[in-house]
């Protein structure tokens, strides 16, 4: 059946609508569109003749209509007057007519609404407020939003006037929110700007902060008053009933016992005309002295000296407290407190014990802290490190060595070559070196305060020829699918290229192989048994090259699932049963057997002479690799037939 679908059905003014034709008959002569529910020549919009593939505008054509060859009609720039019915008249080749009618409705695009209010400053628990959504629009739906949420259910909220008016009875401060109204029709929805309801309230009973009521003589008294109020409250302070000042904060410096008494804060709201007061009682006590720390050793030596820190002055019936690095004391056998907690002893100090240390005296009101004390722990020197780490140099380059040792006070450095003192500096520089500069380079670090010295020796070889390199490994027996191995080519030499070979071939491309450290280090991730190969590293510079001896990687793996041979599972009574178990494993696994769950011997081969049907059952071989910590097993069923029968052998 011929039908017309309007897309969309509800159209906004200025937009477009498509009258879509469904089930258009075959073999047409042509078709025409008419405004209205019937065919009326005076209201023809458009005609289309199939034979000429040409359309003709009718009297009702406005220039905004476009007809498509599939008979659908597009109307653009829709106006209000376009609302209504449209009839398609189809003339078939047999001159039999068919008609279908469709319709759409036109709605205006809504303007942005606004909110008017009958009371801009309602008073809490007293006034009502009526919000009205403007303008009044026909065929529009009105919605309200509070803080971008739909209206809550409340007996104090009432909608009226077709939801255009929202009334809040007996407003509270919680009604201070963002209110929006929304107008909707089938083609548009618009929201107003927010209106913030300004509810006048308070003042509530004021709160005085801080809450503590006990103070020490000499402190500053700083009281702040706050009362919930809109508009903000005006504040007044009274001490023992006597007016002091009209401020939110009351400040009295350097108080004495005489400042003890009752302190009253009064809050006043000029718009509501209400007053509220709160009273707090302040007590001022005489002040104890500020503590300080004394030490029996201001420059203790690491791992040698103990230090006793004492909290002064000594006061009877007083609790002493200690802090290290702004934390309470950690539990440590090297920290000891005296019975009265006044003395803290550090046994065998380390460089990490520098502090800062604070002690405190607990009194009735608070804790008085000392100034922090920092220990000057003498330590070192540690073993010096010589950088850079190169040991091979080419003739003609400059040799620049730097020495560093952790030390307090900082170490003094000396350099020796082959035991002969050179200079007393942290850095050693020799320009344009030759083979004669090869030798033992010693850095000596000396701590003048502790009297300790430490040395480090480095062998420097100056040669145009590179040495034969060697490979060091961080893991001599890696486990398959678990470990990584890092090979490093030694020595580290300046201006040198590092190369690697596996089984005499250059490195294969693999995501499990990674070169780093200037190609000096070759890392194999997640090693497999196939990585058990010969690895060679090579070094080369512009004048020479050399290769290391091969290092074979010993990968621990397995045991894999064992195999029991022979594969036969059926035997004749009286035969010998000789089962051998094998599992791929490195190192070789330990073997054990179970028959029907009962442990047998710990051998690779299980031998039973002259078997009978009593030997029927499950034969399990267990393998265990102690190095990888992995186990595996396999079970085989054996059937023994009486010698009179002739069973078919099965694998």
């Amino acid at each position: 059946k011929l039908t017309i679908e309007s897309t969309p059905f509800n159209v906004a003014e200025g937009k477009e609508v498509l009258l879509l034709v469904h089930n258009l008959p075959q073999h047409l002569f042509g078709y025409s569109w008419y405004k209205g529910e019937r065919v009326d020549g005076n209201r023809q919009i458009i005609g289309y003749v199939i034979g000429t593939q040409q359309a003709t505008p009718g009297p009702a054509y406005s220039g905004r209509e476009i007809i498509y060859p599939n008979a659908s009609l597009l109307i653009q720039n829709i106006i209000q007057n376009d609302t209504g019915f449209y009839t398609l008249h189809v003339i078939k080749s047999d001159l039999v007519n068919e008609e279908a009618t469709g319709q759409f409705r036109v709605y205006p695009e809504l303007p942005k609404p606004s909110i008017s209010s009958n009371n801009s400053k309602p008073v809490e628990d007293k006034d009502a407020v009526a919000f009205t959504c403007e303008p009044e629009t026909q065929d529009a739906t009105y919605l309200w939003w509070v803080n971008n949420q739909s209206l809550p259910v409340s007996p104090r909220l009432q909608l009226s006037n077709g939801n255009r008016t929202l009334t809040l009875f007996n407003v509270t401060r919680n009604d201070t929110a963002s209110y929006k109204c929304e107008t909707q029709n089938p083609v548009s929805a618009r929201r107003s700007d927010s209106v913030i309801l300004n509810v006048l309230y308070g003042p509530d009973a004021p709160t005085i902060s801080p809450l503590n009521t006990s103070y020490r003589s000499g402190e500053n008294l700083n009281l702040s008053c706050h009362a919930a109020s809109n508009p903000p409250a005006q504040y007044s302070w009274f001490v023992n009933g006597t007016f002091q000042q009209s401020t939110q904060e009351l400040f009295i410096p350097n108080i004495t016992v005489n400042n003890s008494g009752s302190y009253t804060c009064q809050a006043h709201n000029s718009d509501t005309g209400l007053n509220r007061t709160t009273v707090t009682t302040i007590t001022v006590y005489a002040e104890p002295p500020k503590p300080f720390i004394t030490s029996n050793n201001s420059n203790p030596v690491e791992d040698e000296d103990a230090v006793a820190l004492t909290c002064e002055p000594e006061i009877q019936n007083t609790t002493y407290l200690w802090w290290v690095n702004n934390q309470s004391l950690p539990v440590s056998p090297r920290l000891q407190l005296s019975n009265d907690n006044r003395t803290l002893t550090l046994l065998s100090v380390t460089r990490n014990d520098v502090g800062p240390y604070e002690c405190g005296i607990q009194n009735k009101l608070s804790v008085d802290h000392s100034d922090p004390v920092i220990l000057n722990v003498l330590y070192g020197p540690d073993d010096p490190t010589i950088s850079p780490s190169y040991t091979y140099y080419r003739p003609g380059v400059n040799l620049s060595l730097s020495c560093h040792a952790a030390s307090n006070p900082p170490a003094q450095y000396s350099w020796l070559i082959d035991g002969n003192i050179q200079q007393h500096t942290q850095e050693l520089f020799i320009s344009n070196i030759t083979e004669k500069n090869s030798g033992l380079y010693t850095c000596q670090a000396n701590n003048s305060a502790s009297g300790h010295s430490r040395t480090t020796v480095k062998t420097i070889t100056v040669s145009a020829e590179l040495p034969k390199p060697s490979i060091s490994s961080n893991n001599s027996k890696p486990v398959e699918d678990k470990d990584a191995v890092a090979f490093t080519c030694e020595p580290e030499a300046q201006n040198t290229t590092y190369l690697w070979w596996v089984n005499g071939q250059s490195l294969p491309v693999s995501p499990r192989l990674q070169l780093s450290n200037g190609n000096r280090t070759l890392t194999l991730f997640n090693v497999t048994r196939n990585d058990a190969r010969a690895y060679v590293c090579g070094i080369q510079n512009s004048v020479s090259a050399n290769r290391s001896d091969p290092v074979t990687l010993d990968v621990l793996y397995g045991p894999d699932t064992p195999i029991i041979s022979p594969p036969d599972s059926s035997y004749l009574s009286g035969a010998n049963l000789n089962l051998s178990c094998h599992s791929a494993s490195n190192p070789s696994p330990q073997y054990s057997w179970r028959i029907n769950g009962i442990p047998q011997q710990h051998t690779q081969v299980l031998f039973i002479a002259k078997i009978t049907p009593n030997n029927n059952g499950t034969y399990a071989c267990f393998v265990s690799n102690l190095a990888t910590g992995r186990n595996n097993s396999i079970v085989k069923s054996i059937t023994v037939s009486a010698s009179g029968t002739s069973p078919g052998l099965s694998a």
């Epitope: 034979g51 000429t52 593939q53 498509y68």
Partner: antibody, heavy 118, light 113 residues
Framework: QVQLVQSGSELKKPGASVKVSCKAS????????MNWVRQAPGQGLQWMGW????????TYAQGFTGRFVFSLDTSVSTAYLQISSLKTEDTAVYYC???????????WGQGTLVTVSS | DIVMTQSPDSLAVSLGERATINCKPS????????????LAWYQQKPGQPPKLLIH???TRESGVPDRFSGSGSGTDFTLTISSLQAEDVAVYYC?????????FGQGTKLEIK
């Protein structure tokens, strides 16, 4: 966008045949009629006729019957003009032009020059 | 058949000046029932296909500069270029699509004086 692309220039001898193609893109070929227009060198536009792309029915203008054939291959969205027994006076630029739904011609192909010379 | 006659055959106008081309169908191309004139104007520049400028005798095609305008009804039509530009040099054709066979005018060549 809606576009008509015609085949390239042709040089033919008298008595030969030529087939000019017009490929439509950006719309469905069968929705709009296709006109053919001739323009002889230095001359005006001469309407040769049109083909109803929906039914395949051709209409030829006076003077363009017999040797001129309009055809379609809707599977490749292409209209064709075939001229047989070419004469030197058939030398011209041949245009295909889509018949707009109201009857005017828009757009036009870029034209195909057919030169008939012995 | 409707015969279309254009005048003049050629026209030379100074840049910025008005150019006027006339077109006379041998019979009316006004369809009374919708009051539409079935006449179009085309512009053809050298080496290019014709381009639709105006349809329904006076409706400018989108993208056509507003210095081009069409007027007239029945059997008398005019294409006007209000201020000639260098790029307007072309041959201009009128065409009726009122009845089959549709027909073109012989063309008017517009040049710059």
């Amino acid at each position: 966008q809606v576009q008509l692309v015609q085949s390239g220039s042709e040089l033919k001898k008298p008595g030969a045949s030529v087939k000019v193609s017009c490929k439509a893109s950006g719309y469905t070929l069968t929705d709009y009629g296709m006109n053919w227009v001739r323009q002889a060198p230095g001359q005006g536009l001469q309407w040769m006729g049109w083909i109803n792309t929906n039914t395949g029915n051709p209409t030829y203008a006076q003077g363009f019957t017999g040797r001129f054939v309009f055809s379609l291959d809707t599977s490749v969205s292409t209209a064709y003009l075939q001229i047989s027994s070419l004469k030197t006076e058939d030398t011209a630029v041949y245009y295909c032009a889509r018949k707009a739904i109201w009857g005017w011609f828009d757009p036009w192909g870029q034209g195909t020059l057919v030169t008939v010379s012995s | 058949d409707i015969v279309m006659t254009q005048s003049p055959d050629s026209l030379a106008v100074s840049l910025g000046e008005r150019a006027t081309i006339n077109c006379k169908p041998s019979q009316s191309v006004l369809y009374r029932s919708n009051n539409k004139n079935y006449l179009a104007w085309y512009q053809q520049k050298p080496g290019q296909p014709p381009k639709l400028l105006i349809h329904w005798a006076s409706t400018r095609e989108s993208g056509v500069p507003d210095r081009f305008s069409g007027s007239g009804s029945g059997t008398d039509f005019t294409l006007t270029i209000s201020s000639l530009q260098a790029e307007d040099v072309a041959v201009y054709y009128c065409q009726q699509y009122y009845s089959t066979p549709c027909s073109f005018g012989q063309g008017t060549k517009l040049e710059i004086k």
